[in-house]
Interface confidence: medium
């Protein structure tokens, strides 16, 4: 708590400048009205104000807010954005998406703080669902934000928001995460045509389902192989050799090179080493010639 | 390109005046708060003193209040370091340093190169 | 303020890992910043914000500390690393230096 001690004479604020920054903290206290402080927010981020009185003015805010901010003085804090803790953005209810990126704005180039978190949160949480415009924003400050999100919390993403997400937003995305989005990707893509759809598809793959990897083999799509170890081993195991070198086209050569990786490695113990070899890459660990093979998963279904 | 020049700094006499001038360049000048810090051979760095982007405000460490004054010309693109009634403990290379932008950026992310002061009879 | 670092003075060998620390004597939130000076020369920003790397200063360089207690860590050692390192607390006014450690050759 700062201690309340009278404003010296001549030194009472009349509007928040640069005459300010050299004063104490005490000072700051006892000469800066807070409803000014509140009007002037944007002219503080013009001043370069120490981390103590950045305190300061903070408490003066938090004595005229005890409940929580307005939006009206939440889009001008700026830097004092960063004194801010989760705690207090819980109190806040934040509504415009300008007042959202003003915020984000302060914390360009950092990782994403708690802060940043809870407020995206309350935003989040405060439209009922990732809109596009939303997603738009939060992917360009946070490449990463999508897969920050849960399963759950993905469900509520609307088919229509997956435009606006870019292959790197995904690139730290687990397979769970993945079998959210691609449904909502194959339902946004369905209009694109064959080889228009498979580019905008293609980082969401990670959770397809083996039919569709199937149908895409049918369409000369040529995926590289770094999408191809990204794919479910689940789904990749009951494709075909000839499945495979359809997928892959050109690309089917890399597969010598991640044989002993998955999902290759697991999708070569399931094939007859025939068939490997019809591929001419040398892959070997498929079912020797004349050995049945027996689906057990299929049995204890049908029984 | 972004640099500070200092100069002005030379030999003079306890109680002896000089200037200190920093010309800057490749960057707005009147956007940042500056400061002056010194470094007396062989120990560590000391902050002398600062002055806002407009020239409105200033600070000075106690060693020098009374006896420094900074200044700067926004049209020219300089600040200075006024040095009055110097002492043999103000002998030190004195260096320009632009402060970051806020927030509360009171570091320095460019510094002149330096000028030595040496206060000696 | 007053800043205590420590140790004054290291001998280290290219590719050790060194570690300084920088000590306020009261809460300066991450107001810290971290500076190389080599010899005749002006210092150098590395580290500000107690841990964010500067633009241009090689990821070896880290930072780390609140509050009172604050290290600067070099993970691997470069020959162009021997010189004298600087903390600076900007917390609050007048801003202060601490005394410095210099990294020398083993």
């Known amino acids: 708590e700062v201690e309340k001690t009278a404003c010296p004479s001549g030194k009472k604020a009349r509007e928040i400048d640069e005459s300010l920054i050299f004063y104490k903290k005490w000072e700051l206290e006892a000469c800066v009205d807070a409803a000014l402080l509140a009007t002037q927010m944007d002219r503080v981020n013009a001043i370069p104000f120490t981390y103590e009185q950045l305190d300061v003015l903070k408490h003066k805010l938090d004595e005229l807010y005890p409940q929580g901010y307005p939006e009206s003085v939440i889009q001008h804090l700026g830097y004092l954005f960063l004194k801010m803790s989760p705690e207090d953005i819980r109190k806040w209810n934040v509504t415009s998406l300008e007042t959202l990126k003003a915020l984000l704005e302060v914390n360009k180039g950092h990782e994403m703080s708690p802060q940043v978190a809870t407020l995206i949160d309350r935003f989040v949480k405060g439209r009922g669902q990732l809109d596009k415009d939303t997603l738009d924003t939060l992917t360009a400050f946070y490449p990463g934000y999508l897969c920050s999100l849960s399963p759950e919390e993905l469900s509520s993403v609307p088919p229509s928001s997956i435009w606006a997400v870019r292959p790197q937003d995904l690139d730290t995305c687990d397979p769970r995460q993945l079998d959210v989005l691609y449904p909502k990707a194959r339902l946004a893509f369905q209009n694109m045509n064959g080889s228009e759809y498979f580019v905008k598809i293609q980082s969401f793959l990670g959770g397809a389902p083996t039919e569709d990897l199937k149908a895409l083999s049918q369409q000369n799509v040529s995926m590289d192989l770094a999408t191809f170890m990204k794919l479910r081993t689940d789904a990749v195991l009951p494709l075909t050799v000839a499945e495979v070198q359809k997928l892959l086209g050109p690309h089917v050569e890399g597969l010598k090179a991640e044989e002993r990786h998955r999902p290759v490695r697991d999708w070569i113990l399931r094939q007859r080493q025939d068939d490997l070899d019809t591929l001419g890459l040398g892959l070997q660990g498929g079912i020797p010639n004349g050995y049945l093979v027996l689906d057990l998963s299929m049995q204890e279904a049908l029984s | 390109e972004v640099q500070l020049l200092e100069s002005g700094g030379g030999l003079v006499q306890p109680g002896g005046s000089l200037r200190l001038s920093c010309a800057a360049s490749g960057f707005t000048f009147s956007s940042y708060a500056m400061s002056w810090v010194r470094q007396a051979p062989g120990k560590g760095l000391e902050w002398v003193s600062a002055i806002s982007g407009s020239g409105g405000s200033t600070y000075y460490a106690d060693s020098v209040k009374g006896r420094f004054t900074i200044s700067r010309d926004n049209s020219k693109n300089t600040l200075y370091l006024q040095m009055n009634s110097l002492r043999a403990e103000d002998t030190a290379v004195y260096y320009c340093?632009?402060?970051?932008?806020?927030?509360?950026?009171?570091?320095?992310?460019?510094w002149g190169r330096g000028t030595l002061v040496t206060v000696s009879s | 303020i007053q800043l205590t670092q420590s140790p004054s003075s290291l001998s280290a060998s290219v590719g050790d890992r060194v570690t300084i620390t920088c000590r306020a004597s009261q809460g300066i939130s991450s107001a810290l910043a971290w500076y190389q000076q080599k010899p005749g020369k002006a210092p150098k920003l590395l580290i500000y914000d107690a841990s964010s790397l500067e633009s241009g200063v090689p990821s070896r360089f880290s930072g780390s500390g609140s509050g009172t207690d604050f290290t600067l860590t070099i993970s691997s050692l470069q020959p162009e690393d021997f010189a004298t390192y600087y903390c600076?607390?900007?917390?609050?006014?007048?801003?202060?230096f601490g005394g410095g450690t210099k990294v020398e050759i083993k």
């Open positions: 600076q607390q900007f917390n609050n006014y007048p801003l202060t």
């Open positions: 340093a632009k402060n970051r932008p806020p927030p509360g950026y009171w570091y320095f992310d460019l």
